[in-house]
């Protein structure tokens, strides 16, 4: 049955009407409007933008638009005492200092309140010492240094290149290795694509460009001072010593011009292999310390940033559902930026704005969605997903009972090559069906579907003729909805060709050069990729809110559960003797997955056949679909990560951006051969298999016939 039957409206008010109303020119105009000045979280400028969005969403026709404010811990540089790094000689004189700001891009020279590059939430400090180059500062990089090269980072300042993993994981790894400071830099190998000019002449990172970003290890906690609860007017706040996830050592980011000056003098051990070499004309020696002539020189950090409890504002818009107003489909993306936010987040915010306008237009013509749609402009995402998390904490009881789906809407583009989707398996079929109905914007695919160009350019590694859809990790505002609350979630954006472009993210990420002109000149002059992303995100929201039967296919979960069980079993089987010695068996997990597969299959058969005109039965079947994601939540959470509660997926413990499957078992098995107490370690593996098997079985039973 078609979507519009849900609300008995005229046939023209269907998905096509919604999609046809979306216009590239509007997205372009909104992006320009959102990117003329910085909108740093906690600032007056970002509050004014929140009020502007509130006013415009009301004009567009939403039923209500409210600001939801919270007082959360943020971090800012000291305006009179700038952060920098120096090389000091044996007398303590500073013979080289890193730059205090990025050279502003053309046309923005007179813009005030551009926050200089800094690592948000770095503690204050002025450590000095020898430098150790730690590559990307990944877990495996420290293993290589400490175990293979016998290099001790204790009491050293480490310098790490950005890329591969979330910067907070880099800092955590450095802390665990005993470092007393961390310098983060962007290496051209990762942030300068060959054959492309630097901004403003191209989309590459200039030598003075620097990536800002938070360095927290929140593990889903939200505001560091109020974990688990909203940072409202009567909140009880932890002391700073008990705050969640704050780094304990000073951290500062620099560009590759400054990095060159630090790295060119490095002595000590040679890099272990070519994977430790970037593209600068330096030896990439690991250290510790400088070479021969410079061996008496040290590196000194000067960090004076402060942590401050500051008010932030979410904008929450509501379009009430006509039939099931107590079922919520949420479209959310953040508004705060590090500087201008040309890509992150305003390329996403502009798309949300146009989606709201299109829904509002339909509503003004008498249409309503079957279910309620909530639109959110989140604040303080860049400071640890704070706005979305605090709002979800405040509304958790409503969300866990009423939340159907969450669609994330941060940056619409990180390239212009093909579509990229990460989502729950429940949404695979929705995404496939939708992209088959949308036109591809790609050159060479005129008249072809988005599904076809996406599948050609980004094929699934497992299923031929299908596109790659990735696991949800974290590092964005879906985290609390999916990982903590178990609300089916998804995200979509246009991306680069990962095979030919090895750089991490896009080169100008979180720099001052992320401007409107970057997008308009180099990434998407016609805004056709933005429009396609608007169609995907908006189309998903439309179907989720309007289809009579929720567009979730539980059979796709069964398929991936089997794949994930096979994968974790094969990891465990690298230790065959220990599995015998400690009686480790995966039989319970495979049995649960088999049961899930059979029950999901039977449920899908019933879904085809039931009487959709019976509102009680319809609601019952939809509730089973809605609550399936919720059934994968363990109320006790993962070990040492209580706000990551999804048993099937969690952000990797080694890279917040990446998703890991069966994370409890995975972490229990990780580096198990280095655990000094094997009996205890394998006991934890067995416990995690038990938790996973129980959870999969319990989830399966939610799909069984109710009586």
């Amino acid at each position: 049955k078609s979507s519009n039957e849900a609300t008995n409206i005229t046939p023209k008010h269907n998905m096509k009407a919604f999609l046809d109303e979306l216009k590239a020119e509007n997205i372009k105009k909104f992006l320009y409007n959102f990117t003329q000045i910085p909108h740093l979280a906690g600032t007056e400028q970002n509050f004014q933008l929140a009020k502007q969005i509130q006013s415009q969403w009301k004009e567009f026709g939403l039923d209500s638009v409210e600001l939801a404010h919270y007082d959360v811990l943020l971090s800012y540089p000291n305006k009179t005492h700038p952060n920098y790094i120096s090389i000091i000689n044996e007398d303590g004189n500073e013979i080289f200092n890193t730059s205090l700001f990025e050279p502003p891009p053309p046309g923005y020279e007179n813009v005030s309140d551009i926050v200089p590059p800094f690592s948000a939430f770095s503690p204050q400090g002025m450590p000095e010492g020898d430098l150790v180059y730690v590559n990307y500062a990944r877990t495996e990089d420290f293993f290589k240094l400490e175990r293979d090269m016998k290099i001790n980072c204790s009491g050293k300042i480490v310098i790490a290149r950005y890329g591969k993993v979330f910067r907070g994981n880099k800092v955590k790894n450095a802390q665990l290795a005993g470092a007393k400071g961390v310098i983060l830099y962007s290496d051209p190998a990762d942030y300068f694509a060959p054959g492309v000019k630097s901004y403003p002449d191209g989309w590459n990172l200039p030598g003075g460009g620097v990536q800002r970003g938070n360095i927290l290890n929140l593990n889903g906690a939200g505001d560091p001072l109020t974990p688990g609860y909203p940072a409202n007017e009567y909140a009880y706040r932890r002391g700073i010593a008990e705050a969640v996830g704050l780094p304990s050592i000073p951290v500062h980011p620099i560009g590759y011009y400054d990095a060159q000056k630090l790295l060119e003098k490095m002595g000590g051990s040679a890099p272990p292999d070519s994977s430790w070499r970037g593209s600068l004309k330096v030896p990439y020696n690991v250290g510790p310390g400088f070479t021969g002539n410079f061996s008496t020189q040290k590196v000194k950090m000067h960090i004076h940033s402060t942590n401050e409890v500051t008010r932030i504002y979410n904008v929450i818009g509501t379009l009430r559902g006509a039939v099931e107003p107590d079922r919520y489909v949420i479209l959310g993306g953040h508004r705060d930026s590090w500087v201008f936010g040309g890509i992150d987040p305003q390329s996403g915010a502009a798309v949300v704005h146009e989606i709201v306008r299109s829904f509002g237009t339909l509503k003004k013509e008498g249409w309503r969605p079957r279910r309620t749609i909530l639109f959110a402009s989140w604040d303080a995402e860049e400071f640890g997903l704070l706005g979305s998390t605090e709002w979800a904490e405040e509304n958790s009881r409503l969300l866990q009972e009423r939340g159907v789906a969450y669609i994330n809407a941060d940056s619409s583009i990180e390239g212009n090559y093909t579509l990229r989707v990460d989502c729950t398996p429940l949404m695979y079929s929705l995404v496939h069906n939708l992209t088959k109905e949308l036109k591809s914007p790609d050159e060479g695919f005129e008249g072809k579907s988005l599904y076809e160009s996406w599948t050609k350019k980004s094929p699934s590694p497992e299923f031929s003729g299908m596109p790659r859809i990735s696991k949800l990790g974290s590092g964005n505002d879906f985290e609390v909805f999916f990982q903590r609350l178990g609300i089916a979630s998804g995200r979509a954006r246009y991306t680069k060709n990962w095979e030919t472009n090895k750089f991490s993210g896009y080169p100008l990420y979180h720099s001052v050069y992320e401007t409107y002109e970057l997008v308009e000149k180099f990434y998407d002059p016609m805004f056709k990729y933005h429009l396609t992303v608007a169609q995907v995100r908006g189309g998903m929201v439309f179907e989720l809110a309007n289809s009579i039967v929720l567009p979730f296919d539980c059979r796709d979960y069964a398929v991936v559960l089997r794949k994930y069980a096979d994968k974790i079993y094969s990891i465990s089987m690298k230790h065959p003797q220990e599995m015998k010695t400690y009686s480790v068996s995966f039989d319970s997990l495979f049995s649960a997955v088999k049961n899930f597969t059979e029950i999901a299959s039977k449920f899908s058969e019933r879904l085809q056949d039931f009487d959709k005109s019976n509102p009680i039965v319809l609601r019952m079947m939809n509730d089973q679909l809605m609550f399936l994601e919720r059934a994968f939540i363990d109320p006790l959470g993962l070990p040492d990560r209580p706000f990551y509660r999804h048993v099937i997926y969690a952000p990797s413990s080694h890279n917040k951006y990446a998703g890991e499957s069966f994370p409890g078992i995975y972490d229990a098995l990780f580096d198990i051969e280095s655990k000094v107490d094997p009996s205890k370690a394998w006991g934890e593996v067995k416990r995690q298999i038990y938790v996973a098997a129980f959870t999969v079985q319990a989830a399966a039973e939610t799909l069984s016939e109710v009586a």
């Epitope: 175990r147 204790s154 690298k574 230790h575 003797q577 220990e578 051969e673 280095s674 094997p678």
Partner: antibody, heavy 117, light 108 residues
Framework: EVQLVESGGGLVQPGGSLRLSCVVS????????MSWVRQAPGKGLEWVAN????????YYVDSVKGRFTISRDNAKNSLYLQMNSLRAEDTAVYYC??????????WGQGTLVTVSS | DIQMTQSPSSLSASVGDSVTITCRAS??????LNWYQQKPGKAPKLLIY???SLLSGVPSRFSGSGSGTDFTLTISGLHPEDFATYFC??????????FGQGTRLDIK
């Protein structure tokens, strides 16, 4: 159950050679560093040598460098210590041991090497 | 190389007593210190790793503490089977792995 069983000890004259063997079971041998540790009669423990999982790295205490060679055969779950140019001060019980991050978590029962004329 | 010095080299105590053995490293080893128990004619057994972590199956009357250069092993309420020789060992800077000279615990 984890087991490490040494063999090859005995009486040898100064300057002579001996090869110690250790066969392990109960853990996946090729995932672990292995060590030899010795204990002279009535004395303390002295680490002798260790070898990486794949045999690519080997380390020795200064007093045995150039005389002893540690090796392994992962296919046979076996660890070896070839001892040449033996001296009276090498007399000790030699233990084969599983070494996790330089922590000795499992020990064999030991094999006695006596160097005497 | 890091030297490990244990004290006392021997001590006598009675069943039910609590005893403390100390171990000092010649330089900071953070918390990379292990304690072993050895009975006559037997191989040593690991008791405590990373200064204070009790190995599975080791009775809770054994505890370890310390960091940097100074460490202690405490046995609270001696049992007859606890009379043995105890060795500390550093796993911070290796090779070489180095042990203390041992502390013999006898029945008074």
């Amino acid at each position: 159950e984890v087991q490490l069983v040494e063999s090859g000890g005995g009486l040898v004259q100064p300057g002579g050679s001996l090869r110690l063997s250790c066969v392990v079971s109960g853990f996946t041998f090729n995932n672990y560093w292995m060590s030899w540790v010795r204990q002279a009669p009535g004395k303390g423990l002295e680490w002798v040598a260790n070898i990486k999982k794949d045999g690519s790295e080997k380390y020795y205490v200064d007093s045995v460098k150039g005389r002893f060679t540690i090796s392994r055969d992962n296919a046979k779950n076996s660890l070896y210590l070839q001892m040449n140019s033996l001296r009276a001060e090498d007399t000790a019980v030699y233990y084969c041991a599983r070494d996790i991050m330089a922590t000795i978590i499992d020990w064999g029962q030991g094999t006695l090497v006596t160097v005497s004329s | 190389d890091i030297q490990m010095t244990q004290s006392p080299s021997s001590l006598s105590a009675s069943v039910g007593d609590s005893v403390t053995i100390t171990c000092r490293a010649s330089q900071s080893i953070n918390n990379y210190l292990n304690w072993y128990q050895q009975k006559p004619g037997k191989a040593p057994k690991l008791l405590i790793y990373t200064a204070s972590s009790l190995l599975s199956g080791v009775p809770s009357r054994f505890s370890g503490s310390g960091s940097g250069t100074d460490f202690t092993l405490t046995i609270s309420g001696l049992h007859p089977e606890d009379f043995a020789t105890y060795f500390c060992q550093q796993s911070f800077s290796t090779p070489p792995i180095t042990f203390g000279q041992g502390t013999r615990l006898d029945i008074k």
